[in-house]
Interface confidence: low
Amino acid sequence: QETELSVSAELVPTSSWNISSELNKDSYLTLDEPMNNITTSLGQTAELHCKVSGNPPPTIRWFKNDAPVVQEPRRLSFRSTIYGSRLRIRNLDTTDTGYFQCVATNGKEVVSSTGVLF
């Protein structure tokens, strides 16, 4: 099974997206796909994907067990992707397990999705 383009498809912040369509003239914010749960092994790399679309382009934040995710150089990072945002955790440790939530806002509305890493 081949992986979606959203894996590692790291983009500039979504605010730079130029959207031009009659379908996008009105403000909207939607979750395109629920976040997947992830099961993986110690020492491996896990990726969680937040697939959202919006106008104006949404700002996406990540939370773990209700606390903001703090990036760790070369180990834990989140980046915009062509379909939203991607959270990547390298060299997994038992302390990395938990509930991960992405929260997207376009300034008016908020949508969120939660996935479990175990």
Epitope: L5, A9, L11, N24, I82
Partner: antibody, heavy 114, light 107 residues
């Protein structure tokens, strides 16, 4: 097996409109983005944008202005590209391609000529 | 926009030759690159994705390498069916952009 089947060639006059269809089969249309790609005669490939059939949301290349519209009819698993106010420079083959660019339609030649 | 520059724009080679096509990105695109083969009148066929991963059903004589800004498509031993035009595509940043193509012809 996955297939994307596009509508046939079109010959249009400048100022007219055209609607190209892309019928998907062999997979669930609503959970895969659909990209559109343009190739002018003898030229390279240009990404136009995508539509997400799950909700109709779209993202466009800034080079493609409001004359270009992506739409869907999920009841017949079909994506559409509509171009209005056609210009000679719109003459090209238009392709649809699934999320990961792994499957492509056969292409639709749109010729704009007076 | 990210510019993708392919080289050479065309090349002549013989069956059995080893051929290398390069694609240079105007900024870092990580490994977010796809290689395509296109024959006249046909849709592009995906050969390589994530810069180095071989797509399903593609012969192992095709391989991809590189990351960041420099990428290479290698055909280890050219077969008659390999004569075509090859394109790279970056999907790191919107708008997604293709290289201008490399036409591979029979010498």
């Amino acid at each position: 097996q996955v297939q994307l089947v596009q509508s046939g060639s079109e010959l249009k006059k400048p100022g007219a409109s055209v609607k190209v269809s892309c019928k998907a089969s062999g997979y669930t249309l609503t959970t895969n983005y659909m990209h559109w790609v343009r190739q002018a005669p003898g030229q390279g490939l240009e990404w136009m944008g995508w539509i997400y059939p799950g909700n109709g949301n779209t993202k466009f290349n800034h080079k493609f202005d409001g004359r270009f519209v992506f739409s869907l009819d999920t009841s017949v698993s079909t994506a559409y590209l509509q171009i209005s106010s056609l210009k000679a420079e719109d003459t090209a083959v238009y392709y649809c391609a699934r999320s990961d660019f792994d499957y492509w339609g056969q292409g639709t030649l749109v010729t704009v000529s007076s | 926009d990210i510019q993708m520059t392919q080289s050479p724009s065309s090349l002549s080679a013989s069956v059995g030759d080893r051929v290398t096509i390069t694609c240079q990105a105007s900024q870092d695109i990580g490994n977010n690159l796809i290689w395509y083969q296109q024959k006249p009148g046909k849709a592009p066929k995906r050969l390589i994705y994530f810069a180095t991963s071989l797509a399903n059903g593609v012969p192992s004589r095709f391989s991809g390498s590189g990351s960041g800004t420099e990428f290479t498509l290698t055909i280890s031993s050219l077969q008659p069916e390999d004569f075509a035009t090859y394109y790279c595509l970056q999907y790191r940043e919107y708008p997604l952009t293709f290289g201008q193509g490399t036409k591979l012809e029979i010498k």
